[in-house]
Structures are given as C-alpha cells and as structure tokens.
C-alpha cells in the first residue's frame, strides 16, 4: 500500500508518457490521476514501467473501479493484465473477442496461467457457447485448450466450431472428450466427399463407434497405424480381419509391430487364427481353429 502524499510542485502528470518511468512509487500515486490513466491505458503498455510501478498503476485503477474495470480499460491493459489476480478478473464482463485477443497476446508463449483460465471462463460463459471465432482464437493461442475442457463443457461446442480445430489441438484429448467431439465432427463434415472427409475426421476417430469404422473400411481410406492405435478398443474389437485390412490398406503391415499393444492385442485375441494368418504378418494369439466363440454379451442381451 502506497502512502498518500501530496504531489511535488510541477510533477503532476498531464499525460501518460516516458517521463513517468523516473517517478518513484509514491510520486506515481500522488501525481497520476486515475481517470487520466484509464483514458490513456493504451500508452501504459508501450512504456517500460518496472514491476513496482505497474503495481502502483493497478492500485490506482482498483480504486477508480472497485466493482471491476470497464471493457474500454480492459482492452488496453496490456502487460498490466499480468498483474491481475483471478479474483480481479471475476469482476469483469468481457464480451469483445478483440479484448480477449489483446489479453491473450500479452501471455503469448507462456503456459495458460490462472488469470488466463479465468478470463476465458468469464468470456465463454458470457457468450453462452464456444462459437467458432472464439474457438479459433483460443486454439491459436493454446493448442491444447480444447482438451482442457470437461466433456460437459465440450457439449456446448456447436458443430460449426469444429472447422476451427486442427489435429494438434486434439493431441492431449482423452477418449471421453473425443466421444463428445466425434459426433459433432461427423455432423460438421457430413457433406464432404470420401477422401476429404477422412482427412478432416481422422483426428476425431478416437471417439468413433464400430459401425462408423466399418463404413470407413469400405472407402479405401488407408488409415495410418498412429490413428488406428488411438481408436476405442471397444469399437475395434468387433471388426473382422477383412475389415481391418481394408481400413488400414498398405498400413496393415504395421500391425505386427503393435501386436502387444492395445487395441491391436485385444483385437487379435478376438480373431480366428486362420483369419489372422491370411494377412501373412505372423500375428499370433488368435482363437485356435476348431474352437467355438461364444459372445456372452449377445447371449445376455437375448435372455
């Protein structure tokens, strides 16, 4: 807390400029009018104030706007944003995407801070849903943003926003998140032709059900092993050897290297060994010839 002292003669700030960098903390407190500061916030970002000077300027704004800063000030906070606490940000009402972009720019290159997380939360809640422009902006600054949301939060993402998602944005998503995103992606890309559709839907396939994988196997998509390994195990298990061969195309040879890993391992255990042998890859662990396979889950469903 800076002591209240009178401003020395001739030091009253008439505008926010470089001369203020030589002001001591108490001089800034005494000689800079908070209303002047609020109207010239865009200049603060350009002037190399020290941390301690920024603290004083923040204190002045806090006194002027105890209920939270107006958006006209927030948009021009610049580096002063880094001084804000999540509690400060919760008082804000940020509605402009330009304001959001301006503040994210300040934090660019750094991990998502609690301040940024609070800002995004306030912004998205204010909008009611995660629209395409917002998602575009957030994933541009934080590629992992989408995967930081809960399945419940993801459910508010409209299918139209899926066009903004890049493959790397989904790198850290878990199956529960992909379960929510996949149907939205399927809807978003439904009017695309086969090969184009596959390119777009590929990153989301970790949420695809068996019937969609079967359908893809009829389209000569040549899925790579990395994508196959991310598929839901329960979706892969019902696929036949022929369907997996069609799904992977020339990449089918990669199964050998992955035979000890899920979902390949579990899939092998469900296939007849003589069917696996038709691949010519030396995959072992299938059901020996002559054994009867009982699908207990089907039996339970019938009873």
């Amino acid at each position: 807390e800076v002591e209240k002292t009178a401003c020395p003669s001739g030091k009253k700030a008439r505008e926010i400029d470089e001369s203020l960098i030589f002001y001591k903390k108490w001089e800034l407190e005494a000689c800079v009018d908070a209303a002047l500061l609020a109207t010239q916030m865009d200049r603060v970002n350009a002037i190399p104030f020290t941390y301690e000077q920024l603290d004083v300027l923040k204190h002045k704004l806090d006194e002027l706007y105890p209920q939270g800063y107006p958006e006209s000030v927030i948009q021009h906070l610049g580096y002063l944003f880094l001084k804000m606490s999540p509690e400060d940000i919760r008082k804000w009402n940020v509605t402009s995407l330009e304001t959001l972009k301006a503040l994210l720019e300040v934090n660019k290159g750094h991990e998502m801070s609690p301040q940024v997380a609070t800002l995004i939360d306030r912004f998205v809640k204010g909008r009611g849903q995660l629209d395409k422009d917002t998602l575009d902006t957030l994933t541009a600054f934080y590629p992992g943003y989408l995967c930081s949301l809960s399945p419940e939060e993801l459910s508010s993402v409209p299918p139209s926003s899926i066009w903004a998602v890049r493959p790397q944005d989904l790198d850290t998503c878990d199956p529960r998140q992909l379960d929510v995103l996949y149907p939205k992606a399927r809807l978003a890309f439904q009017n695309m032709n086969g090969s184009e559709y596959f390119v777009k839907i590929q990153s989301f396939l970790g949420g695809a059900p068996t019937e969609d994988l079967k359908a893809l196997s009829q389209q000569n998509v040549s899925m790579d092993l990395a994508t196959f390994m991310k598929l839901r195990t329960d979706a892969v298990l019902p696929l036949t050897v022929a369907e997996v061969q069609k799904l992977l195309g020339p990449h089918v040879e990669g199964l050998k290297a992955e035979e000890r890993h899920r979902p390949v391992r579990d899939w092998i255990l469900r296939q007849r060994q003589d069917d696996l042998d038709t691949l010519g890859l030396g995959l072992q662990g299938g059901i020996p010839n002559g054994y009867l396979v009982l699908d207990l889950s089907m039996q339970e469903a019938l009873s």
């Epitope: 400029d17 470089e18 960098i21 030589f22 001591k24 903390k25 970002n45 350009a46 002037i47 190399p48 104030f49 020290t50 941390y51 301690e52 000077q53 920024l54 610049g78 580096y79 880094l82 001084k83 300040v106």
Partner: antibody, heavy 120, light 107 residues
Framework: QVQLVQSGAEVKKPGASVKVSCKAS????????MHWVRQAPGQGLEWMGI????????SYAQKFQGRVTMTRDTSTSTVYMELSSLRSEDTAVYYC?????????????WGQGTLVTVSS | DIQLTQSPSSLSASIGDRVTITCRAS??????LAWYQQKPGKPPNLLIY???SLESGVPSRFSGSGSGRDFTLTISSLQPEDFATYYC?????????FGGGTKVDIK
C-alpha cells in the same frame, strides 16, 4: 534470429560529438524499447537512457541530460545515440540493448559494442 | 538511485568448483534483478532474470536466488567456459543500475 549490429569504432577530440548507430533485425523493431549502456575500459556497466522506436520518445539518465540525443529511423530499423561535448571520461564501449517489456526491464539482446575513444 | 554492491570483486576457482557470487541492493528491489556474464571484448549475456528464472539456452549449472536486498548467483560446477566477469542489474526502479562486477578466473 534477433540481431543488433552497431557502427564501427570512433576516435574523437574533446568537445566534439559522436553518433553511434544500432541496426535491429529479426523482430518487430517498433515493439521493443532500445536502451543504451556504456562501459568504460576495465569498468562496470552504466545505463544511459531509452528510446521508443515506435513514437521516437526518449528518457535519459540524469547524468547525460543535455548531452545525449537518441533518435531512430523506422525505415531502416536503426536507432542512433549521439553524445556531445565529449570529454576523456566518455571513452568507453557503447552498447545498444533490447529490453523486455511488462515490468521486465532487463536486456535479452545486445549489440556487439562500439568503442569511442576521446583523445586530444 | 539504487546502488548494487557485488562481492567478491574477484575470485579464483578451479574447474568443478561450486562458485557463489552475491549482490546486495541499497534498498529492496523485490525480485527485479538480473544476472549477466561478460567475456573480454564481448557484450554481456543474460543468464538469470526475475532473480531466479533461467534464461533459455543457459546451462542449468547456473542458478539465482534471493529477494528484497540480497541476491546470489551460483555456478554449481565451474566449467572452462565460465571464466568471465559477472554483473547483477536491478530493474525495480529507474535509473537502471548494475553491480560493479565479479571477475572469476582460474586458480
């Protein structure tokens, strides 16, 4: 990559002026303040002042007020530091240095230095 | 102006030694302190900022600590390329000031 390239060494007589240039590349010139720091032979570092390459506004350390002028040319991404009324104690290596922003006024990139020798 | 006093002004050490340099400010600067390394004929090179944050590309044997008035630069295991002069700099208030330097040479 970020580079600050300074003009060559100068020998000046007492009372004369010297103008040192610093050409920036590898980043947005107008987005970072440029500072000038000098170092007398065998001595420590001394901060002289700053220039805002965007607007051209300046702030100088009190010791150099009235003798130093910092300017910039945005078309060539170059800043200049002119020191007048030179005396022998101004003999030093002069550095331009780019500072971080947002309270972090430390120097992440420096020019290679320009030796200014003041001798009669 | 804030004065920074470095100690020692020079020290002799051997390869592999743990070296500690201190910087004391005439008034508190919070964590607004940086450390630089300078070799003859070269400009200073940033090692540490905000008292303890390692600049990217700087070997992890360098570390900084302290807050307020007293700060320390530590080299955990001195390497041949570490023989140089080290400076601290405060950026708590203007004018920005530097310590007088600590020269580290071979024992």
């Amino acid at each position: 990559q970020v580079q600050l390239v300074q003009s060559g060494a100068e020998v000046k007589k007492p009372g004369a002026s010297v103008k040192v240039s610093c050409k920036a590349s590898g980043y947005t010139f107008t987005s970072y303040y440029m500072h000038w720091v000098r170092q007398a032979p065998g001595q420590g570092l001394e901060w002289m002042g700053i220039i805002n390459p965007s607007g051209g506004s300046t702030s100088y350390a009190q010791k150099f007020q009235g003798r130093v002028t910092m300017t910039r040319d945005t078309s060539t991404s170059t800043v200049y530091m002119e020191l007048s009324s030179l005396r022998s104690e101004d003999t030093a290596v002069y550095y331009c240095a780019r500072a971080q922003r947002g309270g972090s006024v430390y120097f992440d990139y420096w020019g290679q230095g320009t030796l200014v020798t003041v001798s009669s | 102006d804030i004065q920074l006093t470095q100690s020692p002004s020079s020290l002799s050490a051997s390869i592999g030694d743990r070296v500690t340099i201190t910087c004391r400010a005439s008034q508190g600067v919070n964590s607004a302190l940086a450390w630089y390394q300078q070799k003859p004929g070269k400009p200073p090179n940033l090692l540490i900022y905000d008292a303890s944050s390692l600049e990217s590309g700087v070997p992890s044997r360098f570390s900084g600590s302290g807050s307020g008035r007293d700060f320390t630069l530590t080299i955990s295991s001195l390497q041949p390329e570490d023989f140089a002069t080290y400076y601290c700099q405060q950026f708590s208030s203007y004018p920005l000031t530097f310590g007088g330097g600590t020269k580290v040479d071979i024992k």
